[in-house]
């Protein structure tokens, strides 16, 4: 089952998404599709990267971590009620049948008529380690753009780094729900 | 316009070797498909356009070998161990994500004593 | 592994008429990653719908597909003399490829 993301209209959708590269800038290809990974490769392909740089992208997509060391979650721009579905990350491994994918849920919620202060802003002043986009895109930051360093020894979504962690509980509480399939 | 052609194909003794190959751009993703006389489709094996990423039916792994040579528009199917059930007609053809929209006219392999 | 069942083995029409080609899939098929096929005797399978329901390139429009989840359904509105011929059905959403074993079409 799909790890689910809940974001609201307007705002900027994150999907987690990491690997760590073998050593510092042997980058492996990374596609992201809209549609859950089918058995090759990334359908819908809205970004893609390859062993240097991202080689491929859509309006309102990007990659707002440092893709050269791993980090290939994805942002979505300004979404709408369209955006919800499954997305597909895929980390291309080279070799036989060595390719990682993840399959992400994405559910959009209508944005609130009164827009109330939430945890959320604690969350982000508890780790101010801000994440901005790398090659391309506008520069800014976003709701859950602030993430705690992570020791990744193992390809991942972030959902698998979070598992029984106090900082799942706290984007729980904060409205960005996560539930580990 | 998308042009595949496959060539290797021809008789085999059982336990012997043949290599099949397919005209493809280097930009092409290709598999291997094949169809035994009066039967259905049997995916074989599937190749990124780079040549890093490589996928096998269980029915021919460590039998069967796909490769490329982008310099050389070619992608090939190096079979060893053949059986007479792997008689059949051996299409390549172009596919990104599983699906595929060309296809060679195919080979006919016959593994027979 | 994803097991296609099609139905039925056999559909004997006449030009004109409609004809409704049926793959069962053991499991759901996951963001409706099927395509269907058309072969004639001798000749290499021709794409006619990936997706389920979208049209490859070149197809008229009276092959239509549909469906999702498990059951997905070809349709040819109004058969043509070279329309007649072997159709499979092929899943791409999980490992390995399967496809159908296949549905022929052939003249009253």
């Known amino acids: 089952s799909e790890v689910e993301y809940r974001a609201e209209v307007g705002q900027n959708a994150y999907l987690p998404c990491f690997y760590t590269p073998a050593a510092p800038g042997n980058l492996v290809p990374v596609c992201w599709g809209k549609g859950a990974c089918p058995v090759f490769e990334c359908g819908n392909v809205v970004l893609r990267t390859d062993e240097r740089d991202v080689n491929y992208w859509t309006s309102r997509y990007w990659l707002n971590g440092d893709f050269r060391k791993g980090d290939v979650s994805l942002t979505i721009e300004n979404v709408t009620l369209a955006d919800s579905g499954i997305y597909c990350c895929r980390i291309q491994i080279p070799g036989i049948m060595n390719d990682e994918k993840f399959n992400l849920k994405l559910v959009i919620k209508p944005a609130k008529v009164t827009p109330a202060p939430t945890r959320q802003r604690d969350f982000t002043a508890a780790f101010p380690r801000m994440l901005t986009t790398r090659g391309h895109g506008p520069a800014e930051t976003q709701t859950l753009g602030s993430l705690p360093d992570i020791n990744l020894t193992q390809i991942s979504t972030l959902a698998n780094e979070l598992r029984d962690s106090r900082l799942a509980n706290d984007l729980r509480d904060s409205g960005a729900t996560i539930r580990i399939g | 316009q998308v042009h595949l052609v496959e060539s290797g194909g021809g008789l085999v003794k059982p336990g012997g070797s043949l290599r099949l190959s397919c005209t493809a751009f280097s930009d092409y993703y290709m598999s291997w498909i094949r169809q035994a006389p009066g039967k259905g489709l049997e995916w074989l094996s599937y190749?990124?356009?780079?040549?890093?990423?490589?996928y096998y039916a269980d029915s021919v792994k460590g039998r069967f070998t796909i490769s490329r040579d982008n310099a050389k528009n070619s992608v090939y199917l190096q079979m060893n161990s053949l059986r007479a059930e792997d008689t059949a007609v051996y299409y390549c053809a172009r596919g990104r994500i599983g699906f595929f929209d060309y296809w060679g006219p195919g080979t006919l392999v016959t593994v027979s004593s | 592994e994803i097991v296609l069942t099609q139905s039925p083995g056999t559909l004997s029409l006449s030009p004109g008429e409609r004809a409704t080609l049926s793959c069962r899939a053991s499991?759901?098929?996951?963001?409706?990653?099927l395509a269907w096929y058309q072969q004639k005797p001798g000749q290499a399978p021709r794409l006619l719908i990936y997706?389920?329901?979208s049209r490859a390139t070149g197809i008229p429009d009276r092959f239509s597909g549909s469906g999702s989840g498990t059951d997905f359904t070809l349709t040819i509105s109004r058969l043509e003399p070279e329309d007649f011929a072997v159709y499979y059905c092929?899943?791409?959403?999980?490992?390995?490829?399967?496809f159908g074993p296949g549905t022929k079409v052939d003249i009253k």
């Open positions: 499991q759901s098929v996951s963001s409706s990653y």
């Open positions: 190749i990124s356009n780079s040549g890093s990423i490589i």
């Open positions: 997706g389920a329901s």
């Open positions: 092929q899943q791409y959403g999980s490992s390995p490829l399967t």
